[in-house]
Amino acid sequence: MAVTACQGLGFVVSLIGIAGIIAATCMDQWSTQDLYNNPVTAVFNYQGLWRSCVRESSGFTECRGYFTLLGLPAMLQAVRALMIVGIVLGAIGLLVSIFALKCIRIGSMEDSAKANMTLTSGIMFIVSGLCAIAGVSVFANMLVTNFWMSTANMYTGMGGMVQTVQTRYTFGAALFVGWVAGGLTLIGGVMMCIACRGLAPEETNYKAVSYHASGHSVAYKPGGFKASTGFGSNTKNKKIYDGGARTEDEVQSYPSKHDYV
């Protein structure tokens, strides 16, 4: 039961996280005009990964896409790439994890397959979350660098006559959404990996193996050892994950009537 809960919760948390990563990637407010200690303007500028916007106090908002690919800063391209990779990995992870959910039965899919899929999706979520956190952090670092550079030469003289005020940009809402979403996806991935350990069928010290003694039909149950020569091995070729605590909702696979030596 605990495994199912952990897996389910991991899935939900990751789902929310990936939705957040998608939202952050699409948001226009990655950087917003710094209003603190600045000449107050009747125009508010903000920028996203895909377009920059201007909101006038009249309420009129105009957004312009970055229609150039080569003219954009390499850092912006890198952030875009990281976010897209994060979304793609997260989406694949979600797809895989749906089939891996213990509460969903798909044909005769075995626990080992579900465990594998759970681990795969968990790793995908972790990488997805890390991509999002990295992308947002790179952008934030870029903002901080530019902020202090523009603060250093806040007022640039034009011919020594006219002063032009440089617009400074600070963290936008999308950065916080991205950080939180990336964190959630990461946590969800870790939860899936933890659930995977519990899902995996574990070898036991007590495996029923039938022995045919000559003249007698006696069943002998060896105990207290784990054979490395085939005795007590996983008869159905299931992958073994050691150290996973077994729960009551796990079905232990015992040798069948065909498992004769």
């Epitope: 303007t41 009747a42 500028n45 201007v54 006038e56 106090s57 009249s58 309420g59 312009r64 006219v162």
Partner: antibody, heavy 117, light 113 residues
């Protein structure tokens, strides 16, 4: 058709207050409404603005201590109150509706306020 | 505050001739975000409120005759009336619509020569 209709002319004594109204009709009462003063034979001077959506206002530092802008959403009316009036406050007061480029496309007819003892 | 300096203070032009009014701001009114200049031109006739002619330094308001045109960027702007008509006699104001407080130029009185 957009119309901003202002209250009539006022004659007030020095030190008193005056409250000028500006009623909007055919105008989306969500965008900032501005107030502009024009002294006789002088240029235009921006006094401040009020946002009918949230009643937030911005004032010109020159008038900040004496001006108060309020609104009545039920009647789509904006008010501008100027206190501690002096003779130099004798002017025409205009309300204006904001437009693209933060420009003032719609203006009230103006209210002449005369400060005289 | 942003200082808007209009020149000349008054201008006399013959009917059908070109009239040019200049406006200079103490700081750039160009917004980098949308590459628009937040400068507006108004026409004011005696006893009337100002009338919007041009916004974003060069965009003509609907209903304004095409003889009115605006140009300039950053700190230097110009209002041009290509062929002066009798009804164009008025005071013309430029306005900074970018920085608070929003400020106006002193006005240019246009008359017929």
């Amino acid at each position: 058709q957009v119309q901003l209709v202002q209250s009539g002319a006022e004659v007030v004594k020095p030190g008193a207050s005056v409250k000028v109204s500006c009623k909007a009709s055919g105008y989306t009462f969500t965008n900032w409404v501005h107030w502009v003063i024009q002294a006789p034979g002088q240029g235009l001077e921006w006094m401040g603005e009020i946002n009918p959506t949230n009643a937030r206002s911005n004032y010109n530092e020159k008038f900040k201590k004496r001006v108060t802008m309020t609104l009545d959403r039920s009647t789509s009316t904006v008010y501008m109150e100027l206190s501690s009036l002096r003779s130099e406050d004798t002017a025409v007061y205009f309300c204006a509706g904001i437009y693209y480029g933060n420009s003032f496309a719609h203006w009230g007819q103006g209210t002449l306020v005369t400060v005289s003892s | 505050d942003i200082v808007m300096t209009q020149s000349p203070d008054s201008l006399a032009v013959s009917l059908g001739e070109r009239a040019t009014i200049n406006c200079k701001s103490s700081q750039s009114l160009l917004n980098a975000g949308n590459q628009k200049n937040y400068l507006t031109w108004y026409q004011q006739k005696p006893g009337q409120p100002p009338k919007l002619l041009i916004y974003w330094s060069s965009t003509r308001e609907s209903g304004v005759p095409d003889r009115f045109s605006g140009s300039g960027s950053g700190t230097d702007f110009t209002l041009t009336i290509s062929s002066l008509q009798a009804e164009d006699v008025a005071v013309y104001h430029c306005q900074n619509n970018y920085y608070y407080p929003l400020t106006f130029g002193g006005g240019t009185k246009l008359e017929i020569k």
